[in-house]
C-alpha cells in the first residue's frame, strides 16, 4: 500500500480542502472511524488499484485517524493497513467529542490504560487532573491518543488553554471491575404452586461485579415475556440476584426454568435450572404404610410417625377415641409436625412413659381447603408379664397341685418345667418340660381372662402331679412379646415331714 502524502502525521488548515490517495495491487479503501467515507476508486491500466479521499471544508472535527486498507476478505497483515493521523487545529473545538462508552474505562486487573482526551492542535499543552483537583498529574500525553498510564479508580478530566480560554474535557471514569469464574445457584420460593398463585425464582451469582442474566421459562416460549429484576445484595461483596416473578401462575407455567449468567469481560458463563409444578388444586397424600395395629410398651416412651406430602401446608390434628389431642402440660404427650422438604411432612405423636389408659383408637388428620387425608390405628399397650403367684397344695385326693397365676399383654404363654435332681438343676441338667402327656404323670389346666379396665390378660394354670416320690423343683415361666418372668417352688412327697 502506498499513501500520499505519506504522513504519518499531517497538520492541515481549518476550512481547507485536502486530497488523500492510496494505491495497491488489490482494491483499496479509506476508512474513518470504522466507516467508509465517500471516495473515488479506480483501476489503472497497469492493474494498480487506487482510492482518492477528498476532504473539503476541514474543521477540527476532522482530526483523527485515517486508514487505508485492502478492500477484500484476506487477512490484514501490517503492511496491508496504513495509518495516517490528521490534525486540523480549530480554536472553536476544544476536546474532540467522545462516545459515551469512551468516558467509562473498565478494567479487570492493574494494567496500563489510556484516557482518550484529544485536541485538534498538536501544539497545545494538555494536562490531566483528578476531577476535583487542580494539581496536574505526572502522566505522559500523546496528542494522537491521550494520557496513558496506570490509574486508580476515580474520575479524571483533561485541561488545555486555547488562546486565553481554559477548556475542560468531559470527565472520564476509571473503574476496576471484579471478575471471576461464574457459579450460579437457582432457587424458588416454592417449586409447587396452585394455579393463580405466584411463581418467584431467584438466581444468585457471587464474585462478579457486572453480569448479564438471561432466563428461559415455559411462558417465554409462547412469547409472553416477564421482566426480571436484578438486585445487588449488600450482605457480602459482589452478590447479585436476579428475581423472576410470574404472578397468577397457569398450568402451562409448569416446566423447567433456567437462569443463564454471562460475564462479558472474560466470557465466563454458567447456568442452572429448576423445575416448577403448577397444580390445579392442593393435595394431601400419605406416603408409606402404617399398620392398623400399633404397639407400645408400658412405662416406655413411644413415637408414632406418619409421613405425607401436601401443598399448601396443611393443618394436622391428632385424635384419640375421637377426642382432639394437644401437647399435655404434664409432658405426657408431645405432638409435632415438621416440614422435611418443601412438600413432605412428618407428623409425630410421642407418648412419654406410656400408661395403660393410653391404649385406644388414634387418628391423624391432615387437611387444608383443597384436600384432606386421615389415618387411623389401634394402639395396644404391651405389658411385660409378671408371675403374681406360684403355690403348691395337696388336696385329699392324694395328688399334688401347683397353681401359677400371672398377667401381661399380649396374652402370656405359660411353660411348666420340673427338675428332679436338685443338686444338678438347672445348671447341669435342663429342666423337663411338663404338659398333659400321661408319661409325665401330670395334668395341666389353664384359664385365660381379659381384664378390660387394666387392658391385660390374666393366666391361671394348675399343674396336677400324680405321685411325687422325691423332692421336685417345679418352675412356672410366663412369656409374651415383651418379656418373661419365672418363679419356682419345691414340691416334696407326702411322706417327707418338711418342704423347702
Amino acid at each position: 500500500l502506498v499513501v500520499t502524502p505519506p504522513g504519518p502525521e499531517l497538520v492541515l488548515n481549518v476550512s481547507s480542502t485536502f486530497v488523500l490517495t492510496c494505491s495497491g495491487s488489490a482494491p483499496v479503501v479509506w476508512e474513518r472511524m470504522s466507516q467508509e467515507p465517500p471516495q473515488e476508486m479506480a483501476k489503472a491500466q497497469d492493474g494498480t488499484f487506487s482510492s482518492v479521499l477528498t476532504l473539503t471544508n476541514l474543521t477540527g472535527l476532522d482530526t483523527g485517524e485515517y486508514f487505508c486498507t485492502h478492500n477484500d476478505s484476506r487477512g490484514l497483515e501490517t503492511d496491508e493497513r496504513k495509518r495516517l493521523y490528521i490534525f486540523v487545529p480549530d480554536p472553536t473545538v476544544g476536546f474532540l467529542p467522545n462516545d459515551a462508552e469512551e468516558l467509562f474505562i473498565f478494567l479487570t486487573e492493574i494494567t496500563e490504560i489510556t484516557i482518550p482526551c484529544r485536541v485538534t492542535d498538536p501544539q497545545l499543552v494538555v494536562t490531566l487532573h483528578e476531577k476535583k483537583g487542580d494539581v496536574a498529574l505526572p502522566v505522559p500525553y500523546d496528542h494522537q491518543r491521550g494520557f496513558s498510564g496506570i490509574f486508580e479508580d476515580r474520575s479524571y478530566i483533561c485541561k488545555t488553554t486555547i488562546g486565553d480560554r481554559e477548556v475542560d474535557s468531559d470527565a472520564y471514569y476509571v473503574y476496576r471491575l471484579q471478575v471471576s469464574s461464574i457459579n450460579v445457584s437457582v432457587n424458588a420460593v416454592q417449586t409447587v404452586v396452585r394455579q393463580g398463585e405466584n411463581i418467584t425464582l431467584m438466581c444468585i451469582v457471587i464474585g462478579n461485579e457486572v453480569v448479564n442474566f438471561e432466563w428461559t421459562y415455559p411462558r417465554k416460549e409462547s412469547g409472553r415475556l416477564v421482566e426480571p429484576v436484578t438486585d445487588f445484595l449488600l450482605d457480602m461483596p459482589y452478590h447479585i440476584r436476579s428475581i423472576l416473578h410470574i404472578p397468577s401462575a397457569e398450568l402451562e407455567d409448569s416446566g423447567t426454568y433456567t437462569c443463564n449468567v454471562t460475564e462479558s469481560v472474560n466470557d465466563h458463563q454458567d447456568e442452572k435450572a429448576i423445575n416448577i409444578t403448577v397444580v390445579e388444586s392442593g393435595y394431601v397424600r400419605l406416603l408409606g404404610e402404617v399398620g392398623t395395629l400399633q404397639f407400645a410398651e408400658l412405662h416406655r416412651s413411644r413415637t408414632l410417625q406418619v409421613v405425607f406430602e401436601a401443598y399448601p401446608p396443611p393443618t394436622v390434628l391428632w385424635f384419640k377415641d375421637n377426642r382432639t389431642l394437644g401437647d399435655s402440660s404434664a409432658g405426657e404427650i408431645a405432638l409435632s409436625t415438621r416440614n422435611v422438604s418443601e412438600t413432605r411432612y412428618v407428623s409425630e405423636l410421642t407418648l412419654v412413659r406410656v400408661k395403660v389408659a393410653e391404649a385406644g383408637h388414634y387418628t391423624m388428620r391432615a387437611f387444608h381447603e383443597d384436600a384432606e387425608v386421615q389415618l387411623s390405628f389401634q394402639l395396644q399397650i404391651n405389658v411385660p408379664v409378671r408371675v403374681l403367684e406360684l403355690s403348691e397344695s395337696h388336696p385329699d385326693s392324694g395328688e399334688q397341685t401347683v397353681r401359677c397365676r400371672g398377667r401381661g399383654m399380649p396374652q402370656p404363654n405359660i411353660i411348666w418345667s420340673a427338675c428332679r435332681d436338685l443338686k444338678r438343676c438347672p445348671r447341669e441338667l435342663p429342666p423337663t418340660l411338663l404338659g398333659n402327656s400321661s408319661e409325665e404323670e401330670s395334668q395341666l389346666e389353664t384359664n385365660v381372662t381379659y381384664w378390660e379396665e387394666e387392658q391385660e390378660f390374666e393366666v391361671v394354670s394348675t399343674l396336677r402331679l400324680q405321685h411325687v416320690d422325691r423332692p421336685l423343683s417345679v418352675r412356672c415361666t410366663l412369656r409374651n412379646a415383651v418379656g418373661q418372668d419365672t418363679q419356682e417352688v419345691i414340691v416334696v412327697p407326702h411322706s417327707l415331714p418338711f418342704k423347702v
Epitope: 461485579e209 436484578t230 438486585d231 445487588f232 445484595l233 459482589y238
Partner: antibody, heavy 118, light 113 residues
Framework: QVQLVESGGGFVQPGGSLRLSCAAS????????MSWVRQAPGKGLEWVSA????????YYADSVKGRFTISRDTSKNMLYLQMNSLRAEDTAVYYC???????????WGQGTLVTVSS | DIQLTQSPDSLAVSLGERATINCKSS????????????LVWYQQKPGQPPKPLIY???TRESGVPDRFSGSGSGTDFTLTINSLQAEDVAVYYC?????????FGQGTKVEIK
Amino acid sequence: QVQLVESGGGFVQPGGSLRLSCAASGFTFTNYAMSWVRQAPGKGLEWVSAISGVGGSTYYADSVKGRFTISRDTSKNMLYLQMNSLRAEDTAVYYCAKAPHWGPFGSWGQGTLVTVSS
Amino acid sequence: DIQLTQSPDSLAVSLGERATINCKSSQSVLYRSNNKKFLVWYQQKPGQPPKPLIYWASTRESGVPDRFSGSGSGTDFTLTINSLQAEDVAVYYCQQYYSTPYTFGQGTKVEIK
C-alpha cells in the same frame, strides 16, 4: 450535583412513631444503595439500615430490627425510615447516605434530629 | 458482625507534625480475588456530616489533599495525616462496607497540641 435532604425529625415520646424522609437528586436513584446512619449527641456514628438499588432488598442493625422499616419511592427519588416503638436511646441526628453497591458512603445529607423523651 | 476498634481515642499533634490513627477489624475486610479492602476513612467536623477521605483503604477521594494517606492489610488499617494543618482538627472514623451490618470505629478526635 448530588443532593440528599432529610426531613421529618422532631420530638416524640417513648413508644411513639416518626417517619423520616430523604429527598435525593443529582444521580440515578436506583443505581445506588441508600442507608440511614445516626449519631447520638456527642457520640459516634451508627449504621441503622440500608436498601439496595434496583431490587430494594433491606438490611437493619440489630438495635432497630423489628421497629424500623426502610423503604423508598423510586418515582419520587425519596428514601424513608419509618420508626416505631421509639426509645430514649434512639435520640440522634439521622443522616441519609448514598453508596455505590459494595462501595463507601460517598454523599451524605445534613441530617435531621430525632429526640425521644418523656 | 465485624467490629472495628480505633486507637487512640484522641490525639494531640503539633502543626506540621504527623498524625497516625489505627483501625483494627475483628475479621478481614479484604476481598481476595481483587485485593480490594472494603474500608473507608471519614472526617467529621462539628455540626457537619462525615466526609469521605480515603476509600478502598488507600484510595484518596478526589479533592482530598495528598497529606492524607491510608494503608493496611485485611484487618489492620492506618490513616496518616502528614504535616497536620489547622483545618484537619476533626473526628476521624473508619467504616467497613464489606458486609451488612455496616460498622464504624468509635472515632478518634484529632486536636492541635
